[in-house]
């Protein structure tokens, strides 16, 4: 199809070589076409309504994305040629940064419903550049955390070094939906809830004497609980004695609950105490058996091929530790009678 009639938009993606980063392009079809093609998302029971600019058809492939090769070859269908680019309804997700993402991307309705729709397309000229050392040293990360229940803010990485007074008008999106009330380089959240997590996009316009373009950055925001102030607790074993049968195999499980920590280095191990000696036992790897927003439960087993008389004189100790402190639970084996 002839792309000369497509509306054109220029975008700049300046990526950090230090961190993983994603990027998105929205199929900004001219109104009113936009409303025909991009699907309005159903709100989940825990989300709050936002301004929804895209609504309409339910079809997953409402729009078609192409890349225009620089050598003048025919347009290429994104889905067939670019595994690191994913189409999600009207959004194109770039999973990895790199100057090789530079180029012209075209989107248009998949179903042409009227003669006018033939010319309904957008050409996005994307320039991708690595961030130079001259750029701000302390720019905001593309992965930002918000502490549940507290006040927080989300900063636009490409503008985080500028004061609010100098900052140009910013357009913010959350999960592809326009946040119409947000216009500054920072979104302030009075009280953080789990629905505040998601993919945020901040856009602002930059110009020179010749042209203007949109500078875009993508921020992955996650909501987290504060780092635990507690040492881990052992949920199992609860009792300090265990009845066993001599000569039979035995598995003793240690299950410990560790509170959330951003830097999580849990320790869970078994050691044996025999009179004045104690030594760590080589046991199977620890494994996570449950994870919630606030904590994680890790299990590690000690396996005895067969219980001996000597084992009855020993203490089996489970030791668990996080950055706050450690806890132990010892188990003494007792022969089952009768």
């Amino acid at each position: 199809f002839n792309i000369s009639g497509c509306s054109t938009k220029k975008l700049l993606w300046t990526y950090s070589t230090r961190s993983e980063e994603e990027f998105v392009l929205f199929c900004d079809l001219p109104e009113p076409q936009k409303s025909h093609f991009c699907h309005r998302n159903r709100l989940s029971p825990k989300q709050v309504p936002e301004h929804l600019p895209f609504m309409g058809s339910n079809d997953l492939s409402d729009v078609q994305w192409y890349q225009q090769p620089s050598n003048g070859d025919p347009l290429e269908d994104i889905r067939k040629s670019y595994p690191h680019i994913i189409q999600d309804k009207c959004t194109l997700h770039f999973l990895t940064p790199g100057v090789n993402n530079s180029g012209s991307y075209i989107c248009r309705p998949k179903m042409i419903k009227s003669p006018y729709d033939v010319a309904c397309c957008v050409k996005m000229i994307l320039e991708v550049k690595p961030q130079t050392n001259a750029s701000c040293e302390y720019s905001a990360s593309h992965k930002q955390d918000l502490l549940l229940g507290s006040t927080g803010s989300i900063s636009c990485p490409s503008l985080s070094c500028q004061s609010d007074a100098q900052s140009p008008a910013v357009t913010w999106y959350k999960n592809g939906k326009l946040l119409s009330v947000e216009r500054s380089n920072r979104i302030v959240v009075d009280e953080v809830y789990d629905y505040h997590q998601g993919t945020y996009v901040c856009d602002y316009t930059q110009s020179d004497t010749v042209s203007s373009w949109t500078v875009r950055a993508v921020v992955q925001v996650r909501t987290i609980v504060g780092d635990t102030k507690l040492k881990p607790d052992i949920l199992d074993p609860v009792e300090d004695t265990l009845e066993v049968e001599l000569g039979k195999p035995l598995t003793i499980s240690c299950k410990a609950r560790f509170g959330f920590e951003r830097v999580f280095n849990p320790v869970i191990k078994w050691y044996i105490k025999d009179s004045d000696l104690e030594w760590e036992v080589s046991v199977p790897e620890a494994k996570s058996i449950k994870s919630t927003l606030k904590d994680e439960i890790i299990e590690r087993n000690i396996i005895l091929e067969k219980v001996t008389q000597r084992d009855l004189r020993r203490k089996f100790v489970c030791f668990v530790q996080n950055s706050i402190g450690n806890t132990t639970q010892s188990v003494q084996l007792k022969e089952k009678r009768g």
């Epitope: 989940s44 029971p45 629905y195 998601g198 992955q220 996650r222 058996i289 919630t292 927003l293 439960i297």
Partner: antibody, heavy 117, light 111 residues
Framework: SLEESGGDLVKPGASLTLTCTAS?????????MSWVRQAPGKGPEWIGC???????TYYANWAKGRFTISKTSSTTVTLQMTSLTAADTATYFC????????????WGQGTLVTVSS | AAVLTQTPSPVSAAVGGTVTISCQSS????????LSWFQQKPGQPPKLLIY???KLASGVPSRFKGSGSGTQFTLTISDVQCDDAATYYC???????????FGGGTEVVVK
């Protein structure tokens, strides 16, 4: 929203992979993405989940070994099923939890898997 | 393995009345409160009503109330409406996620 795909009519012993595609949010954040199945006329059955921001996977005791849940991109999660039998015939749902695998606040419409010779 | 036993079906309720559904666990629920309630209508996926035993999910009318702790839980629907006719399921979590399980369901019939 969530959308499941890949449901099909397959023969006993076959394998099948179902895909759950998220729209309006991405799995770069931490979500408990569960797979739940429901046989015709029966109650739902929890299969397992993946914690997207952390990579941990958990399975119901009965599902261990035959079912594998993976995050394949920032918007897709899959359920691989092997050695299928007639007892696996069900509608398979993917569902999202924001704090654990129990408070499932967003569900897809489901995809039907029929195992029959 | 853990088992969640629900009030036998069907349970009848008159419009404007109150209905109570119980869910009993064979072992302690994690944190004594990791239990959710869902409503399901034919041809639809389950819908979250209550999480953490007593917290109301967003958009759910306050006529739905969850209570209980440990092994015994209850869902109460007051001022029953015709639209409440559905099957209700509890879902419980335990120390190990491998034990996560749904209750057998309770059908509510509104007269």
């Amino acid at each position: 929203s969530l959308e499941e795909s890949g449901g099909d009519l397959v023969k006993p012993g076959a394998s099948l992979t179902l895909t759950c595609t998220a729209s309006g949010f991405s799995f770069t954040s931490t979500y408990w993405m569960s797979w739940v199945r429901q046989a015709p006329g029966k109650g739902p059955e929890w299969i397992g989940c993946i914690v997207t921001g952390r990579g941990n996977t958990y399975y119901a005791n009965w599902a261990k070994g035959r079912f594998t849940i993976s995050k394949t991109s920032s918007t897709t999660v899959t359920l691989q099923m092997t050695s299928l039998t007639a007892a696996d015939t069900a509608t398979y749902f993917c569902a999202r939890g924001s704090s654990d695998e129990i408070a499932l606040d967003l569900w897809g419409q489901g995809t039907l898997v029929t195992v029959s010779s | 393995a853990a088992v969640l036993t629900q009030t036998p079906s069907p349970v009848s309720a008159a419009v404007g009345g109150t209905v109570t559904i119980s869910c009993q666990s064979s072992q302690n629920i994690y944190n004594k409160n990791q239990l959710s309630w869902f409503q399901q209508k034919p041809g639809q996926p389950p819908k979250l009503l209550i999480y953490e035993a007593s917290k109301l999910a967003s958009g759910v009318p306050s006529r739905f109330k969850g209570s209980g702790s440990g092994t015994q839980f209850t869902l109460t629907i007051s001022d029953v409406q015709c639209d409440d006719a559905a099957t209700y399921y509890c879902l419980g979590g335990y120390i190990s996620s491998s034990d996560t399980t749904f209750g057998g369901g309770t059908e509510v019939v509104v007269k």
